[in-house]
């Protein structure tokens, strides 16, 4: 999916008012310095591409983020503010249903959510120069 035509300010508002705290709660008990940010993004569409991938695509050691509350809210926000997103995701969801995993919090998942927090921070500050 090409995130170029999303309403970025509406997504930012959704993140600030409905998603950010759920990411913090997921990470509770973890030091903010525990994980290094290894995933970066250069502009808002790129950030959303990376956020989508880290949130919904199972990875080695962390297969379960898609069923977390912050993921559900992300899915809902993208569907509303990215034209055509919901249509492109319907087929993907049918495939995902066949391999739905039980929610398990692993250290790898914590690291992944830490990366997500960094991506969202970058998304919210698009005018900052890339480090």
């Amino acid at each position: 999916y090409d995130f170029t035509n999303c309403d970025f300010e509406k997504i930012k508002a959704a993140y600030l008012s409905t998603i950010s705290k759920d990411l913090i709660t997921y990470m509770s008990g973890t030091k903010s310095t525990e994980f290094n940010n290894t995933v970066s993004c250069s502009n808002r569409p790129h950030c959303l591409t990376e956020i989508q991938s880290l949130t919904f695509n199972p990875t080695a050691g962390c297969a379960s983020l898609a069923k977390e509350m912050f993921a559900m809210k992300t899915k809902a926000a993208l569907a509303i503010w990215c034209p055509g997103y919901s249509e492109t995701q319907i087929n993907a969801t049918q495939a995902m249903k066949k391999r739905r995993k039980r929610k398990v919090t692993t250290n790898k998942c914590l690291e992944q959510v830490s990366q997500l927090q960094g991506l969202w921070r970058r998304f919210n500050r698009p005018l900052l120069k890339q480090q």
Partner: antibody, heavy 117, light 107 residues
């Protein structure tokens, strides 16, 4: 303007079935997470069920296995199929647009379901 | 999973400040929303994201959430604010949960 209009409520005997419908207008229905919320006479609000744009569903424990939520995005319509109805299911049923799988920003006017012999 | 506890009733004199509490285990780690419902009408969202007001909701409505308690505050309460108020949050099992409701009486 943004509107949700429920229909299909009425009197039904215990063990019976009923299907509620909710016609949506004024917004891109196919993009939104939609829910049903009920309110028994003189009581508080109780979330019943919700459904994503892609058909992914969620249910309250009290209705799991008896109620089925569905949607037809081509008709901008939300449904609630209620089977094995009990007296405690008697309530006003509200169709609701649940913004971001989160808060409810738009409510219908409600339709009354009465389960009684 | 989380249960939300509200006082059944709160009374306030016109012009005074009304505070309605909503309690739940570690509620401060979740977002809380508040609805106003008048007799015979559907509920109306008055606070979302703990403390944000939807457009059209008067400034006298405010919200806070920390620890185990969320609070809806109505400053300079008016007669038209008399209604039932419900808090709402969510569970780890991805379901929506409401408090039992509080009847606000403006004396």
């Amino acid at each position: 303007q943004v509107q949700l209009v429920e229909s299909g409520g009425g009197l039904v005997q215990p063990g019976g079935s009923l299907r509620l419908s909710c016609a949506a207008s004024g917004f891109t229905f196919s993009s939104y997470y939609m829910s049903w919320v009920r309110q028994a006479p003189g009581k508080g609000l109780e979330w019943v069920s919700g459904i994503f744009f892609d058909g992914e569903t969620y249910y309250a424990d009290s209705v799991k296995g008896r109620f089925t939520i569905s949607r037809d995005n081509s008709k901008n319509t939300l449904y609630l199929q209620m089977n094995s109805l009990r007296a405690e299911d008697t309530a006003v049923y509200y169709c609701a647009r649940q913004q971001y799988f989160d808060h409810i920003d738009i409510w219908g006017q409600g339709t009354l379901v009465t389960v009684s012999s | 999973d989380i249960e939300l506890t509200q006082p059944p009733s709160v009374s306030v004199a016109p012009g005074q400040t009304a505070r309605i509490s909503c309690g739940g285990d570690s509620l401060g780690g979740k977002y809380v929303y508040w609805y106003q419902q008048k007799p015979g009408q559907a509920p109306v969202l008055v606070i979302y994201g703990d403390s944000k007001r939807p457009s059209g909701i008067p400034e006298r409505f405010s919200g806070s959430n920390s620890g185990n308690t969320a609070t809806l505050t109505i400053s300079g309460t008016q007669a038209e604010d008399e209604a039932d108020y419900y808090c709402q949050s969510y569970t780890n099992a991805l379901s929506t949960v409401f408090g039992g409701g509080t009847k606000l009486t403006v004396l």
